[in-house]
């Protein structure tokens, strides 16, 4: 993975001029941060702030950098060789099922059940009933007694609509 | 040097259909996404959607949504408004506009304008 | 999601500088770094002035610029001149791939 490139690093006219840079494929595909042109002679770097693309590819364009959404908050912007990283707001959480938005980490748990695992940006709480030690069951039960426990995974680039 | 011409515009009666067409040139149109803003005489901005560089993504603005297909020919440099359906507030100035950000708010290039009036 | 909100003119003498308002909510303006603004001379089409915020595309004089506050987002003509006169129109990203335009204002070089 690159250095991480911020807005700072670059001048404004370089962010804002349309004209990309451009070099040589090799063996056909062209570098992280580039695309190949449409008659594969060139290699035509990304839009910095505007789009990018990760690995060697034979793509004729670079892909949408993400938006964070409200919600979330940016963990570092989108370069030309990384997309953005995205993380739901502290108190709120990534549901694998709902990965399209932040839903909110609940309060406590449910009588009978105590606390081991506390909210994090890809998790709600996590409860266990407090006589066997035993997780709740994945299935999803009366409102009043829901719990969840997403393994869930670290914060990783929102590439829902890139 | 940037150009986008658009065309097809012209009066049609409620709930008719109309074609428009935007043709590039001065850039490679395929690297870009495009997107279409109206303008209703003597009123402001209103962008209406915009689509992907090879068309696999498109969006729209909620008052268009199931009337309007946007869809483009990378072979023929040009961008397409399918209307249908149209209504007296569709009556608008349509332009086309390279869409630099892909989201519709970074519009660097625009063309002139189709005139577009629904009338019966 | 509603338009934003733009004075429907401002004015100010050659040499002088004018400050026209944009104001969203924390949903668009608020929320996001990505408010642009466009001029349009009569019967023409809409030029990129500023994007994300304060940014200049190239070619566009230094005369113009762009902030932004909270909720409100403003360009500054400074150094005004008759070719100046024009409509103005700020746009903001507002989530959801939506972009939506402020109602224009009128600047009148007097």
């Known amino acids: 993975e690159s250095a991480l490139i911020t807005q700072q690093d670059l001048a404004p006219q370089q962010r804002a001029a349309p004209q990309q840079k451009r070099s040589s494929p090799s063996e056909g595909l062209c570098p992280p941060g580039h695309h190949i042109s449409e008659d594969g002679r060139d290699c035509i770097s990304c839009k910095y702030g505007q789009d990018y693309s990760t690995h060697w590819n034979d793509l004729l364009f670079c892909l949408r950098c993400t938006r964070c959404d409200s919600g979330e908050v940016e963990l570092s912007p989108c370069t030309t060789t990384r997309n953005t990283v995205c993380q739901c707001e502290e108190g709120t959480f990534r549901e694998e099922d709902s990965p399209e938005m932040c839903r909110k980490c609940r309060t406590g748990c449910p009588r009978g059940m105590v606390k081991v695992g506390d909210c994090t940006p890809w998790s709600d709480i996590e409860c266990v009933h407090k006589e066997s030690g035993t997780k709740h069951s994945g299935e999803v039960p009366a409102v009043e007694e829901t719990v969840t426990s997403s393994p869930g995974t670290p914060a990783s680039p929102c590439s829902l609509s890139g | 040097e940037v150009q986008l011409v658009e065309s097809g515009g012209g009066l049609v009666q409620p709930g008719g259909s109309l074609r428009l067409s935007c043709a590039a040139s001065g850039f490679t149109f395929s690297s870009y996404w495009m997107s279409w803003v109206r303008q209703a005489p003597g009123k402001g901005l209103e962008w209406v959607a915009n689509i992907k560089q090879d068309g696999s993504e498109k969006y729209y603005v909620d008052s268009v949504k199931g009337r309007f297909t946007i869809s483009r020919d990378n072979a023929k440099n040009s961008l397409y408004l399918q209307m249908n359906s149209l209504r007296a507030e569709d009556t608008a100035v349509y332009y086309c506009?390279?869409?630099?950000?892909?989201?519709?708010?970074?519009?660097?290039?625009w063309g002139k304008g189709t005139l577009v009036t629904v009338s019966s | 999601q509603s338009a934003l909100t733009q004075p429907p003119s401002a004015s100010g003498s050659p040499g002088q500088s004018v400050t026209i308002s944009c104001t969203g909510t924390s949903s668009d303006i608020g929320n996001y770094n990505y408010v642009s603004w466009y001029q349009q001379h009569p019967g023409k089409a809409p030029k990129l002035m500023i994007y994300?915020?304060?940014e200049r595309p190239s070619g566009v004089p230094d005369r113009f610029s762009g902030s932004k506050s909270g909720n409100t987002a403003s360009l500054t003509v400074s150094g005004l001149r008759p070719e100046d006169e024009a409509d103005y129109y700020c746009?903001?990203?507002?989530?959801?791939?939506?972009?939506?335009f402020g109602g224009g204002t009128q600047l009148t070089v007097l």
């Open positions: 746009s903001s990203y507002a989530g959801n791939n939506a972009v939506i």
């Open positions: 994300e915020v304060n």
């Open positions: 506009a390279r869409d630099f950000s892909g989201y519709g708010d970074y519009l660097d290039y």
